[in-house]
């Protein structure tokens, strides 16, 4: 959850909610009674910005949360890493029937980086996210969290950027970290030929042809 947040060299981060200074200020619909930005303390006494919703008593929940616009920087496939807590409905009294244990992840490609509203029908569903059996127990300052981590990928992307959205249908969720990244093959030298940083293709198995150049003091 915390720390210097060093990621693998072949991953380029497009969004990291944990690195944002100040409030995240994402767009929620409805404006009140749904997703709420809540700060909690990490073990270094600095705030972690989370988004939370927990309307487990009320039926027919449809709460949306949308990120700011995310540039794709030429990536055709991006990865979304979500760290979250999701409370077991069995541990909550009197919520059977209304309490859920999943949420939905969506995306919407756009060239417009200033869309002000959430239009649900524009979004394409990536997946339904559930709490995995495996979780990391994290002791953050004055509280303990059971943190689930799920990674999904989406592509091929073609527009300048995209928005992510999270739909709650009646669960008790805290989104603790959202990171969006793409993968690249780092600069490589083979047989005196140098090949530049290269963004991976639209599929994980795609081959991307790149032109190399001779290293210094060598020639073709």
């Amino acid at each position: 959850v915390t720390g210097s947040r060093v990621y693998p060299a072949n991953e380029v981060t497009l969004l990291d909610s944990r690195s944002v200074q100040g409030e995240l200020g994402w767009i929620a619909s409805p404006l009140e009674g749904g997703w709420e930005e809540v700060s909690i303390m990490d073990e270094k006494n600095t705030p972690i910005r989370t988004y939370q919703v927990c309307n487990v008593m009320e039926p027919s929940q449809n709460n949306w949360l949308r990120t700011d616009w995310i540039t794709r920087e030429g990536a055709q496939r991006v990865y979304i890493e979500i760290k979250f807590t999701l409370r077991d409905c069995n541990s909550l009294p009197g919520v059977m029937g209304t309490c859920k244990e999943t949420f939905n992840l969506y995306y919407y490609e756009s060239d417009n980086d200033k869309e002000r509203f959430i239009r649900e029908n524009q979004f394409v569903k990536i997946d339904t996210i559930a709490a995995d059996e495996s979780f990391t127990q994290v002791d953050i300052g004055d509280r303990i969290m059971k943190l689930n981590t799920e990674i999904r990928d989406v592509g091929p992307l073609s527009k300048k950027g995209f928005y992510l959205a999270f739909q709650d249908v009646g669960a008790c969720i805290a989104l603790v970290s959202v990171r969006v990244f793409y993968k690249k093959c780092p600069l490589t030298v083979r047989n005196l030929a140098q090949f530049p940083d290269t963004i991976t293709g639209a599929d994980t198995s795609s081959l991307v042809e790149v032109r190399g150049s001779c290293v210094n003091n060598s020639e073709e």
């Epitope: 809540v38 700060s39 909690i40 303390m41 006494n45 705030p47 989370t50 939370q52 919703v53 927990c54 807590t85 999701l86 409370r87 541990s91 009294p93 300052g141 004055d142 509280r143 303990i144 969290m145 059971k146 008790c172 969720i173 805290a174």
Partner: antibody
Amino acid sequence: QVQLVQSGSELKKPGASVKVSCKASGYTFTDYSMHWVRQAPGQGLEWMGWINTETGEPTYADDFKGRFVFSLDTSVSTAYLQISSLKAEDTAVYYCARIPLYYYGSRYWYFDVWGQGTTVTVSS
Amino acid sequence: DIQMTQSPSSLSASVGDRVTITCRASENIYRNLAWYQQKPGKAPKLLVYAATNLADGVPSRFSGSGSGTDYTLTISSLQPEDFATYYCQHFWGTPWTFGQGTKVEIK
């Protein structure tokens, strides 16, 4: 229903020890940590610390390190507060209160259920 | 440690009055704050959590507001059963200290 029932009032002499119990019912004991709060006569509430009901690990506020011990007997869903070497200034009502052991968001992050309080009087 | 300063320490009011109690934290507690009501000889009862959210079963005349270091509990129209002592408590790093309390008395 969910409740925390504490042991009865105690009258002790200075230097003695006392053990206050807090019996939980109506919920899974290990789903909630147990906290202790002191209220001296005519005074406000003081948070003393808490005990992890899964591991038994206690955490004490600075003013309550040394003579105060939190413990558990999970087989009977009971938390205990023991005070040794009692002093006149330990005279107070002691409350137990629960909060979820794991943080799932602010919706349940507060003391929702309290014991009725145990009065401990220290007097010679 | 974070200090919680409540004001006033006591107040006299009549039934139907609007009552405001404030709580100031010594540093930003990011709305990690609860309000409790306590009557003589009884355990505290939760009124408001996360600074602004009314607890289940609490009458709508109670409301919480604030952010950063400054928080307020408001009773819009004081009722006879509201005469009690009110405490704020922060949840931003242990120790989770309480304010010193505000006693609401009948004028």
